[in-house]
């Protein structure tokens, strides 16, 4: 393990608050939670809750912890090594191509298709024809039967930020 | 002593390029973080970029993001600022500095940059 | 980002007499990143205070920073001719890194 430097091995002008964890950079990098001094001499812990860095790493600035928006709910928080990690509330999904908002599920498929995949925080319903069995492209149809469906079980985070 | 002298200065066109560099000397370059800070005639101070030692780590001001790029050569102690698409707003000194975030403590002379047709 | 704000935009003061500027954050400052700079016309800046507090190398101890927050201030306990000139707070808590837009002290 690194050793703690300590304030008086430090240049003059690049000491930092007492208040933070310092330990040795290998090899010009440093560890998971951390991010590099500016005189490169030493790593400084990242501050909970607040900022995060998952790699080894010479960053100047930990990384901003996301904060998750409303429509969304907050599956695990950010540690040090690890940013939040946020998913759209039942009933509504994040998709690849617009990740900045939670959109709503269908609550069914337009006419001649049948449901085969639920809606989950990561994707919506799916639908397919009922004859050949091909992927409705899934735009919002203009007429919906009257088949609903339930929210699927989160299985995963959809959007795992960092 | 801890020197560092920019070069690359000069009048270029609304949409064209330049390319400042940094020599310091006086310090062991690879393991600092450098920056660039520049001043518009008349005007304050202005971050324009900063880099990690081993020049792994970069940032930007939002202002000259997609168009600067800083980078660093470690066995000449050389820092970089490619600059393209220059604007008008661009036009200034730019001055190099070691440090980046505690403070900058050490600045260069700086190079002007003239940015006009 | 991090906006600083710093007042007054000029002080007229005599040799002698005490000088207080204020550097105030948007968002909260940690103090290991708050650094005061002095610029005099055509030169470059000179680093006065890093830590918001720390003395740089060779500054003269009529110089002196404190503050925590959002609230900062450089003092300079009497001005000497050579101390009136532009002056610059400057943070680094948290990208982009920023200046303040200046405190001129000026001769009265």
């Known amino acids: 393990e690194s050793a703690l430097i300590t304030q008086q091995d430090l240049a003059p002008q690049q000491r930092a608050a007492p208040q933070q964890k310092r330990s040795s950079p290998s090899e010009g990098l440093c560890p998971p939670g951390h991010h590099i001094s500016e005189d490169g001499r030493d790593c400084i812990s990242c501050k909970y809750g607040q900022d995060y860095s998952t790699h080894w790493n010479d960053l100047l600035f930990c990384l901003r912890c996301t904060r998750c928006d409303s429509g969304e709910v907050e599956l695990s928080p950010c540690t040090t090594t690890r940013n939040t990690v946020c998913q759209c509330e039942e009933g509504t999904f994040r998709e690849e191509d617009s990740p900045e908002m939670c959109r709503k599920c269908r609550t069914g498929c337009p006419r001649g298709m049948v449901k085969v995949g639920d809606c989950t925080p990561w994707s919506d319903i799916e639908c397919v024809h009922k004859e050949s069995g091909t992927k409705h492209s899934g735009e919002v149809p203009a007429v919906e039967e009257t088949v609903t469906s339930s929210p699927g079980t989160p299985a995963s985070p959809c959007s795992l930020s960092g | 002593e801890v020197q560092l002298l920019e070069s690359g200065g000069g009048l270029v066109q609304p949409g064209g390029s330049l390319r400042l560099s940094c020599a310091a000397s006086?310090?062991?370059?690879?393991?600092?973080?450098m920056s660039w800070v520049r001043q518009a005639p008349g005007k304050g101070l202005e971050w324009v970029s900063a880099i990690s030692g081993s020049g792994g780590s970069t940032y930007y001001a939002d202002s000259v993001k997609g168009r600067f790029t800083i980078s660093r050569d470690n066995s000449k102690n050389t820092l970089y600022l490619q600059m393209n698409s220059l604007r008008a707003e661009d036009m200034a000194v730019y001055y190099c500095?070691?440090?980046?975030?505690?403070?900058?403590?050490?600045w260069g002379q700086g190079t002007l940059v003239t940015v006009s047709s | 980002e991090i906006v600083l704000t710093q007042s007054p935009g000029t002080l007229s003061l005599s040799p002698g007499e005490r000088a207080t500027l204020s550097c105030r954050a948007s968002q909260s400052v940690s103090s290991s990143y708050l650094a005061w700079y002095q610029q005099k016309p055509g030169q470059a800046p000179r680093l006065l205070i890093y830590g918001a507090s720390s003395r740089a190398t060779g500054i003269p101890d009529r110089f002196s920073g404190s503050g925590s927050g959002t609230d900062f201030t450089l003092t300079i306990s009497r001005l000497e001719p050579e101390d009136f000139a532009v002056y610059y707070c400057q943070q680094g808590s948290q990208p982009p890194i920023t200046f303040g837009q200046g405190t001129k002290v000026e001769i009265k």
């Open positions: 500095a070691k440090g980046a975030r505690v403070s900058f403590d050490y």
């Open positions: 006086g310090f062991t370059f690879s393991s600092y973080a």
